[in-house]
Interface confidence: low
């Protein structure tokens, strides 16, 4: 499996779109800052088999897609940018799915490193809870947008390391 240059370009475009989605200054939302405890250890990539790393990356993309495709999200962001964002994420998920199947075979895929995948799920549940508690305010969404940009950067770095291994 080769995470190609095209995939790398998709990553950069995803981050660029996230940056463009910003609607208010993060500095006006400092009081709303929150530590969502990004499971960084799951993205260090050293202790992982390639297939495990790919399944964690896929979960990250899937949960990001879920988060930004809710009704509340549609109301918070520019529709055109969101559409482009979905397309980029969808393309990345397709690439990663193809890789997982190539690396471990269809049968093994669902059972991959459940603990790492759960850590990612729980991270997104913390984000969802925060948005609920903040009643999906513009500042809450801005904090989440910045957080997702940060976590997507970690994903991008892990993918770079995987490409270097190829």
């Amino acid at each position: 499996c080769n995470l190609s240059q095209t995939h790398s370009l998709n990553n950069r475009r995803t981050l660029m779109l996230m940056a463009q989605m910003r609607r208010i200054s993060p500095f006006s939302c400092l009081k709303d800052r929150h530590d969502f405890e990004f499971p960084q250890e799951e993205f260090d990539g050293n202790q992982f088999q390639k297939a495990q790393a790919i399944s964690v990356l896929h979960e990250m993309m899937q949960q990001t897609f879920n988060l930004f495709s809710t009704k509340n999200s549609s109301a918070a962001w520019d529709e055109t940018l969101l559409e482009k964002f979905y397309i980029e994420l969808f393309q990345q998920m397709n690439d990663l799915e193809a890789c997982v199947i190539q690396e471990v075979g269809v049968e093994e895929t669902p059972l991959m490193n459940e603990d790492s995948i759960l850590a990612v799920k729980k991270y997104f549940q913390r984000i969802t809870l925060y948005l609920m508690e903040k009643k999906y305010s513009p500042c809450a969404w801005e904090v989440v947008r910045a957080e997702i940009m940060r976590s997507l950067s970690f994903s991008t770095n892990l993918q770079k390391r995987l490409r270097r291994k190829d």
Partner: antibody
Framework: EVQLVQAGAEVKAPGESLRISCKVS????????ISWVRQIPGKGLEWMVK????????IYNPSFQGHVSISVDKSITTVYLQWSSLQASDTAIYYC???????????????WGQGTLVAVSS | DIQMTQSPSSLSASVGDSVTITCRAS??????FHWYRQKPGKAPELLIY???NLQTGVPSRFTGSGSGTECTLTITSLQPDDFATYYC?????????FGQGTKLDVR
Amino acid sequence: EVQLVQAGAEVKAPGESLRISCKVSGYTFTSYWISWVRQIPGKGLEWMVKIDPRDSYTIYNPSFQGHVSISVDKSITTVYLQWSSLQASDTAIYYCVRHYLTQSLVDYFDHWGQGTLVAVSS
Amino acid sequence: DIQMTQSPSSLSASVGDSVTITCRASQSVSNYFHWYRQKPGKAPELLIYSASNLQTGVPSRFTGSGSGTECTLTITSLQPDDFATYYCQQTHGYPFTFGQGTKLDVR
């Protein structure tokens, strides 16, 4: 095999403190939330509080906030429910439960402890 | 809080019968509906999660359906083990809430 094993029944007087335990085994402790659920004898089920054992992040049902507290000891994979001052109305069976989290972040209670009966009477 | 109302509160049936229990939420909970069975003197056990998914090990005579504000649990071909109390639950909003229970007993 996933197991949640709870401590035995407790009989206490009003005003006393109490801590009940739930020892879990058979899975990675820090991967799943744990909740406590109350059942007053002959009545229905009430969700009280949940905790993420990874970082002790808690969410309380406002009806129970301030009256009970939840905690974990990761070293012995045990979750606790504690009262500093019991009331007769705390008489109930208390269940610890494990949350399963689906792909779309729906959580449900897939494993239950056997329950701990707490009787508060003068 | 989201109120969960089960109907009926009690129900009599015979072995081999089919029964349906309904649960209504005071606001939409999407598919965050779950069903549990509690046998006398025992802890509840999960039957159905996310409105219609059968928990591993639960017989296929249990089926769940619905979403939004209403869901149903149907049990076909009742077995002696099925005479118990059934609870619905929502985990869409905090605090999580249960229905008041439906007691199924032998006619």
